[in-house]
Each structure stands twice: as structure tokens, then as C-alpha cells.
């Protein structure tokens, strides 16, 4: 997260760290007791690593009573996701067992009504992604509030040049932005999950390159079918 600040500890009990061989790779969001939603591209570089999900964490390194690492039983990328586009960049991870819920571990309601979030709405994005262009990684969860940007502006030739589909949304990226390592994490508007940070190699913190988020409401049928 660029231009953000440390989050209040455990105030985002839905927040997940998707890890490979014990290292944070991407964000994720607990959407059901045994399921975490993230971005499909996140695992492309997981290779033969052990994929796990950390729940109930604020610090990645320090012991915390609520922290627990879960093995992944099944990784389900969206069937239309592919390596060379950010379209359909969603991944569902089934935990090896139901998460132990509590004040620091709780699923987040996700948007089912397929309607664009009003431009200008302030939404919260959180993650353990890099906090500087030099690539410094935080130990503790960071967050930032970002205004939603209308699709027409986001699709301008000077911005994302038509790449933003109806199934994506944008947020402003003027020095405050999601960045590498935040992919798969939640964009939360009004206490509801609206978007998932896409995992392209986009430049961060440049206002001409807004943050791109996959709209979960557009994938309600798929999410329901996997969780069923």
C-alpha cells in the first residue's frame, strides 16, 4: 500500500495473507468459513511451493493469539482467467478446514448486486504489499482510503486505454494506491466487499494509471457455484 498507514490491529478480521513457503505473496479476503477469495495471477509464480493462508494476523512476523496458518485443500482459479490478461482475475482457495471464527477472524459480506459503485465513493484497501517504490515490505497490515474512479475516465487513452471492462472497477492512484503484494486483497466500500485487487504488473502511485479491481458482484454466480 503506497501512501497509506498502519491499519488498526485486527479491525479487518476478513483480511488474509496468501503465502507460499511461509512468505507473504498476495492478499486475500475471507468470504466464507472455509473459503478465501484472492487473485488468480497470484499463484502463477507459486510453482511447486506450499500454498497456505494466514488468518487473524496484523503482524506477519510477531506471535499473535488470533493468528493461524491454514493449508489449502483446493485452489480454484476462475475458468476464464489466463496468464496474459487481467480479465477474470479471481481465485477461490478452500482451506483445509473451517476457520476458527472470532473477533479477529470473520468473513466479509460481498456485493451481489451487479451495479457500479458511485464514482467518488471512498473505499478501503488493505494489504501487506510494498509501501515504497524501493520495494520496502511492511510487517504490519497497511490500509488506505481511495476514491472510486468512473470507468470512462479510467479507460481514457492516457490512462488504461479501454482495457477496463464492465467486470472491473478503478480507484484513484495519486500517490495513494495498492501495489505489489496487495494483489488479491479486498476493496471495501461501506463495509461490503466490492473489489479484489488485480495482479497485473501495473505501475503504482501514478495518477494516470489508476488501480484496477475485479468487481465481485459481476462474479456472484461463479463464487456461489464454487462455494456450494
Amino acid at each position: 500500500i503506497l501512501g497509506g498507514r498502519e491499519a488498526e490491529a485486527h479491525a479487518r478480521p476478513y483480511m488474509a495473507s496468501v503465502q507460499v513457503n511461509g512468505e507473504h505473496l498476495c492478499g486475500g479476503v475471507l468470504v466464507a468459513e472455509q473459503w478465501v477469495l484472492s487473485a488468480a495471477h497470484c499463484l502463477e509464480d507459486a510453482a511447486d511451493g506450499k500454498v497456505q493462508v494466514l488468518l487473524g494476523a496484523h503482524s506477519l512476523s510477531q506471535p499473535e493469539p488470533s493468528k493461524r496458518l491454514y493449508d489449502v485443500l483446493r485452489a480454484v482459479p476462475h475458468p476464464d482467467s489466463r496468464p496474459d490478461t487481467i480479465d477474470h482475475d479471481l481465485l477461490l482457495l478452500q482451506l483445509s478446514e473451517k476457520a476458527t471464527l472470532g473477533p479477529a477472524v470473520r468473513p466479509l459480506p460481498w456485493q451481489r448486486v451487479d451495479r457500479d459503485v458511485e464514482p467518488g465513493t471512498l473505499c478501503d484497501v488493505a494489504g501487506w504489499g510494498i509501501v515504497s517504490h524501493a520495494g520496502r515490505r511492511p510487517d504490519r497490515l497497511q490500509h488506505v482510503l481511495l476514491p472510486v474512479l468512473d470507468r470512462a475516465t479510467c479507460n481514457r487513452r492516457t490512462h488504461h486505454d479501454g482495457a477496463i471492462t464492465q467486470r472491473m472497477m478503478c480507484a484513484e492512484s495519486n500517490r495513494r494506491d495498492s501495489c505489489k503484494g496487495d494483489s488479491g486483497g479486498p476493496l471495501v466500500c461501506g463495509g461490503v466487499l466490492e473489489g479484489v485487487v488485480t495482479s497485473g504488473s501495473r505501475v503504482c502511485g501514478n495518477r494516470k494509471k489508476p488501480g484496477i479491481y475485479t468487481r465481485v458482484a459481476s462474479y456472484a454466480a461463479w463464487i456461489d457455484s464454487v462455494l456450494a
Partner: antibody, heavy 120, light 112 residues
Framework: EVQLVESGGGLVQPKGSLKLSCAAS????????MNWVRQAPGKGLEWVAR??????????YYADSVKDRFTISRDDSESMLYLQMNNLKTEDTAMYYC???????????WGTGTTVTVSS | DVLMTQTPLSLPVSLGDQASISCRSS???????????LEWYLQKPGQSPKLLIY???NRFSGVPDRFSGSGSGTDFTLKISRVEAEDLGVYYC?????????FGGGTKLEIK
Amino acid sequence: EVQLVESGGGLVQPKGSLKLSCAASGFSFNTYAMNWVRQAPGKGLEWVARIRSKSNNYATYYADSVKDRFTISRDDSESMLYLQMNNLKTEDTAMYYCVRHGYYWYFDVWGTGTTVTVSS
Amino acid sequence: DVLMTQTPLSLPVSLGDQASISCRSSQSIVHSDGNTYLEWYLQKPGQSPKLLIYRVSNRFSGVPDRFSGSGSGTDFTLKISRVEAEDLGVYYCFQGSHVPYTFGGGTKLEIK
């Protein structure tokens, strides 16, 4: 650039031995599972062996046709993959490819191959 | 072992035509993790094989959208909507759900 380069092929007599090598570059070799796939002259592809990464205890798997005769191994410090072939048979004559194994998919990067000929 | 049977063995086509290759497995290739590891590879003359389709229907990087994969259980199909000269070669299906992993016998796509 991601690259796999095989070496060590050649002519060997039946019941003889040969060790194939594969030099990997351009990616984090130690995190990937690796495979050997072969192709007999004018024939189709046949998976031979797979070795997983350290995080999966270097687990190995083999095709029934080579079990107990071939051994797959790796040296992560040198980014090298090996195939030790013992008790070779004429039916082992083939082009041997070193192949990287992805997460969502299997064989995403292939070497150019090295030829093994088993003949008396 | 899972036997992968491809048909036809040879497929003569005219450029611009649609081509369809079938692959049938001797048993279900749904993995214990719920995914179906069915892939398609193309080997052009004198070259190493290249991955086209993974998990039944997902196109790999750089693969044109004229290639599509479908199927489930034991029956799978690769379709090329408009064959181009660069598509000629031998197509192989592959299952990675059960060890030992197995390839189909191959289908040679050639000009009519």
C-alpha cells in the same frame, strides 16, 4: 530469458548407463517441480519422471516403463536437473526433453532436447 | 494407468476451416483437488512441444483465441476456429490428474 538446455545424450549399448543433465536459467529453479519427457523417433510424447521442490521434500514420480532403472535428481544450488539412466533398453531410444512444471499447468517451458540412442 | 485416446490420427484441413480434435480418457481425470488437469500441446516439425490449453479450457499466454478447449469427465475436445498455416503440426492431449501422467497418441493437422 527462461531457458532449459539439455546435455549428456549419445550412443550407448543395451544394459549400459547414461546421465542426462539440464541447465536451467532465467527463473527461480529451486521453487519449481521439474520433469523429463521423451519422444521416440517418429512417435508421440511420453512422460518419464518428475521431481518436486525442496518444500515438497524432493518427492519423485516415475513412469512404469522406467521405474527402478531411471533416477531423477536435482541440484538447486547449480540450477541443474539430472536423469540417471541404468540398464538401458533399445526402447529407451528417444529425444529427452527437460520440462518445467507450473502451478496451474504442467509443462510450460521445454528444452530443445538431447538424443539418446541405445543400440549394439 | 490412464489411457488417453485421440481421434483422428490425421486431420487434413483447408486453411480457414474449423478443425476439431477429440481426446477420451479411460477413466475420469478429475483430480482429488477437484480440478481437471487436461492439457493440449502443439508440436511443430523440428520443434519442442508448446502448451496451448490447460485445465480443459484455459488458453496459455500468447495462444490465439481461435483455439478453444472443452469437455469434462472423460471426453475432451480441442477446436481451432479458423486454421492458419502456423497451426500445422501434431497436437497432443495430456492428463496430469493421475500418476503416471499420460499423453494421447497425437493428431497430425495437415493441409488438405
